[in-house]
Interface confidence: medium
C-alpha cells in the first residue's frame, strides 16, 4: 500500500495539508443494523472439527480497543470419534482489517488508519503429501 | 457505537466536537507492510472439508472498495471420499470489520466509519441433533 503526496480531487488542498486534515466522523454506523455489534459469539470454535481459541488483543489507543484473535487448538483436525486425524490439518483463516490508532499525546485527537491481519477461525484441510521425484 | 475520548487527555475537547473533528493521519497505514494488501489468497477455500466461494462486494465510495465475502459451497461437509457427510454441517465464520465511507462531496475529505459483518470462510461442525422430549 502506498500514499503518494499530491492531491487533485480537492483542487485547493495541498497534499501536505490534506494528509494532516482528513476528518473522520467516529460515530460508528452499522451498515447492517444494531444487531451487528450485539450479536453473541457463536459456539463454532468448540464444535468445529478444527476448533480454535480466542485470544484478547487489547490496545486502549486503538479502535476497536479489543480484538479477539483466533488460534487453532490443534495442528490436526478432530474426527467423529473425537480423535486427532493425522491426514487432516487445522489451518487458520485470516482476514485483513482496518483499525484506528490514536497518535500519542495528540490534542485534538488524531488517529491514523492501520491494517491488521487477524485470525478469525480455523478450517480443516487435507494434508498435502509431497512425493519425492 | 462511538469512540469517546478520555476527558483528561484533551481537557477542552467536548465529546460532541470530538466526534465530528477527529483527524486521521494517512501517512502511516500498513502495520504489516505493503505486502499485506497484495498477498495472494490462500487455497483453503478449495481444500477445506467445508469449502467456500468468494464473492466480490464492491463499492467505489467505500474503503476498502473491494471486499471478498465468503459463502459456503455446501450445507454439509465433504468427507475423505469427496462425498457430502450428512452428519456434518458447513458453517460460515463471520467477522465484524470497519470500513470508511466518504461523506458525499466533502472537501477537505471527510469520512465516516461503518461496521460491516462479512463472511471470511467456512468451518465444519457436527450437526446438533435435537431429541424430542
Amino acid at each position: 500500500a502506498a500514499i503518494i503526496p499530491q492531491s487533485s480531487a480537492c483542487p485547493n488542498t495541498e497534499a501536505k495539508d490534506f494528509l494532516q486534515n482528513v476528518k473522520v466522523n467516529l460515530k460508528v454506523f452499522n451498515s447492517l443494523g444494531a444487531k451487528v455489534s450485539s450479536r453473541r459469539p457463536s459456539d463454532y470454535l468448540n464444535r468445529s472439527t478444527s476448533p480454535w481459541t480466542l485470544h484478547r488483543n487489547e490496545d486502549p489507543d486503538r479502535y476497536p480497543s479489543v480484538i479477539w484473535e483466533a488460534q487453532c487448538r490443534h495442528q490436526r483436525c478432530v474426527n467423529a470419534e473425537g480423535k486427532l486425524d493425522h491426514h487432516m490439518n487445522s489451518v487458520l483463516i485470516q482476514q485483513e482489517i482496518l483499525v484506528l490508532k490514536r497518535e500519542p499525546e495528540s490534542c485534538p485527537f488524531t488517529f491514523r488508519v492501520e491494517k491488521m491481519l487477524v485470525g478469525v477461525g480455523c478450517t480443516c484441510v487435507a494434508s498435502i503429501v509431497r512425493q519425492a521425484a | 457505537a462511538a469512540i469517546i475520548p478520555q476527558s483528561s487527555a484533551c481537557p477542552n475537547t467536548e465529546a460532541k466536537d470530538f466526534l465530528q473533528n477527529v483527524k486521521v493521519n494517512l501517512k502511516v497505514f500498513n502495520s504489516l507492510g505493503a505486502k499485506v494488501s497484495s498477498r495472494r489468497p490462500s487455497d483453503y477455500l478449495n481444500r477445506s472439508t467445508s469449502p467456500w466461494t468468494l464473492h466480490r462486494n464492491e463499492d467505489p465510495d467505500r474503503y476498502p472498495s473491494v471486499i471478498w465475502e465468503a459463502q459456503c459451497r455446501h450445507q454439509r461437509c465433504v468427507n475423505a471420499e469427496g462425498k457430502l457427510d450428512h452428519h456434518m454441517n458447513s458453517v460460515l465464520i463471520q467477522q465484524e470489520i470497519l470500513v470508511l465511507k466518504r461523506e458525499p462531496e466533502s472537501c477537505p475529505f471527510t469520512f465516516r466509519v461503518e461496521k460491516m459483518l462479512v463472511g471470511v470462510g467456512c468451518t465444519c461442525v457436527a450437526s446438533i441433533v435435537r431429541q424430542a422430549a
Epitope: 497534499a15 | 494517512l26 466480490r56 464492491e58 467505489p60
Partner: nanobody
Framework: EVQLVESGGGLVQPGGSLRLSCATS????????MYWVRQAPGKGLEWVAE????????YYVDSVKGRFTISRDNAKNSLYLQMNSLRAEDTAVYYC????????????WGQGTLVTVSS
C-alpha cells in the same frame, strides 16, 4: 482478485516517445479513478497523472505537464500513458494504480514497467 499489468516500457533516447498500457481485472474499472505513479532509482514513489472514472478530468504533476497524456478505455478495462519528449529524469519504473476514496492511497498496483531514457 484485483490485477493490474503494465506494459510498454523500454529504452528510449532523450526526446523520444513511449506509450504505456495497463490491463486490469477483478474490479469494475469504470467506477474508479486511475493513476500512474513512478519510482526513479533510489527515490520514493511519485504521483505522475490521474484520470477520473469517465475520463473527463485529468491531472498531472508539473514536471510532465504538456509532455504526458493519460487516457483510458473503459470498454477494454485499460489505462494508458502517452509519454512524449522524454527526458533522462523520466527514467523510472512506472506503475498503474487503482484509485480509492482515500485520495492518493493505493492498495492495488501492478508489477511496473521500466522506462529508461538514455542516449
Amino acid at each position: 482478485e484485483v490485477q493490474l499489468v503494465e506494459s510498454g516500457g523500454g529504452l528510449v533516447q532523450p526526446g523520444g516517445s513511449l506509450r504505456l498500457s495497463c490491463a486490469t481485472s477483478g474490479f469494475t474499472f469504470s467506477s474508479y479513478g486511475m493513476y500512474w505513479v513512478r519510482q526513479a532509482p533510489g527515490k520514493g514513489l511519485e504521483w505522475v497523472a490521474e484520470i477520473k472514472q469517465d475520463g473527463s478530468e485529468k491531472y498531472y504533476v508539473d514536471s510532465v505537464k504538456g509532455r504526458f497524456t493519460i487516457s483510458r478505455d473503459n470498454a477494454k478495462n485499460s489505462l494508458y500513458l502517452q509519454m512524449n519528449s522524454l527526458r533522462a529524469e523520466d527514467t523510472a519504473v512506472y506503475y498503474c494504480a487503482k484509485g480509492e476514496i482515500l485520495p492518493l492511497y493505493f492498495d492495488y498496483w501492478g508489477q511496473g514497467t521500466l522506462v529508461t531514457v538514455s542516449s
